[in-house]
């Protein structure tokens, strides 16, 4: 039985050209995390954090994605096309997979604020 919960940064906004941290946190489970996958709205993989092998950033995102902090991901040089859903998938033993969702809105406005409140989706 899966007892854990994923907390995410929820719905966030950031300004064009800026950067944003995508963060998920798994709690309330004894399961061991063996891998975390980060996917974009079109299901393309941005990055994988593997317990043994460390981080792998996919080539299409190498210039704009930085690993961390922790198991999170930092998106840089944001464009309007980055607006959309992002998913973290935790592979855990023996629970299985936990999935969290973040919605990022990239704003033209220079007064866009990056909200970083945590919420359970």
């Amino acid at each position: 039985m899966m007892t854990g919960t994923i907390e995410t940064t929820g719905n966030i906004s950031a300004k064009k050209g800026g950067s944003v941290i995508l963060q998920c946190h798994l709690s309330s489970t004894m399961a061991q995390v063996t891998q975390v996958n980060w996917e974009q709205h079109d299901h393309s993989l941005l990055a994988i954090r593997n317990a043994e092998l460390g981080w792998h950033i996919y080539p299409a995102f190498k210039d704009r994605v930085a690993p961390g902090p922790g198991l999170g991901l930092t998106l840089q040089s944001l464009t309007m096309n980055d607006t959309g859903e992002y998913f973290c998938t935790y592979h855990t033993y023996p629970d299985g997979t936990y999935r969290g969702r973040i919605f990022l809105e990239v704003l033209e406005s220079s007064v866009a604020e990056h909200s970083a409140r945590f919420q359970i989706p």
């Epitope: 061991q32 023996p94 997979t97």
Partner: antibody
Amino acid sequence: QMQLVQSGSELKKPGASVKVSCKASGYTFTSYPMNWVRQAPGQGLEWMGWINTNTGNPTYAQGFTGRFVFSLDTSVSTAYLQISSLKAEDTAVYYCARTGGYSVDEYSFDIWGQGTTVTVSS
Amino acid sequence: DIQLTQSPSFLSASVGDRVTITCRASQGISSYLAWYQQKPGKAPKLLIYAASTLQSGVPSRFSGSGSGTEFTLTISSLQPEDFATYYCHQTIFRPTFGGGTKVEIK
């Protein structure tokens, strides 16, 4: 190469305790969960539970709570199984086994120790 | 807990035979199933994981198939070293093993 090496056979009297060790080498010990599996004489494999090698938190399968304790010493990449108040029915081969694979569909016990025979007899 | 039922429990076969072992799960487990071979006095050895993926170094005469609740391990042409006991194993939630299938020489 990657391997798990267990401590040697044990002959114990009922009521005694035993501690079996499982030393890992050739890989990062804390990256993979560790399991314990029991095989009674002439019987099949029975999953006893597992220990999170990151946190040290153990999880015990039904029937293996109370007298069974899983622990770790990550400084020497070793997992331990301790059984207290031994009974004749604890006579078995005990295996440690690593959960290999990174994504859930890859999980399997890919590396096993050679097994430790524990005999409980008066 | 999820129960795994293997059949048959015993199987007599000859070198060169095609051998099939079945494993049924009490509820759906997707493809979260592994197969192991165990010889007397030895630790189990991983043959197949993810229901059908051959572990590195395992001969190609071994194959696995199935998903959900029904799985099979097939040995296409039994070799002398294949006489052993085979176990299926569901690998997530609370892992469990099947009861084993002993493959003996006919």
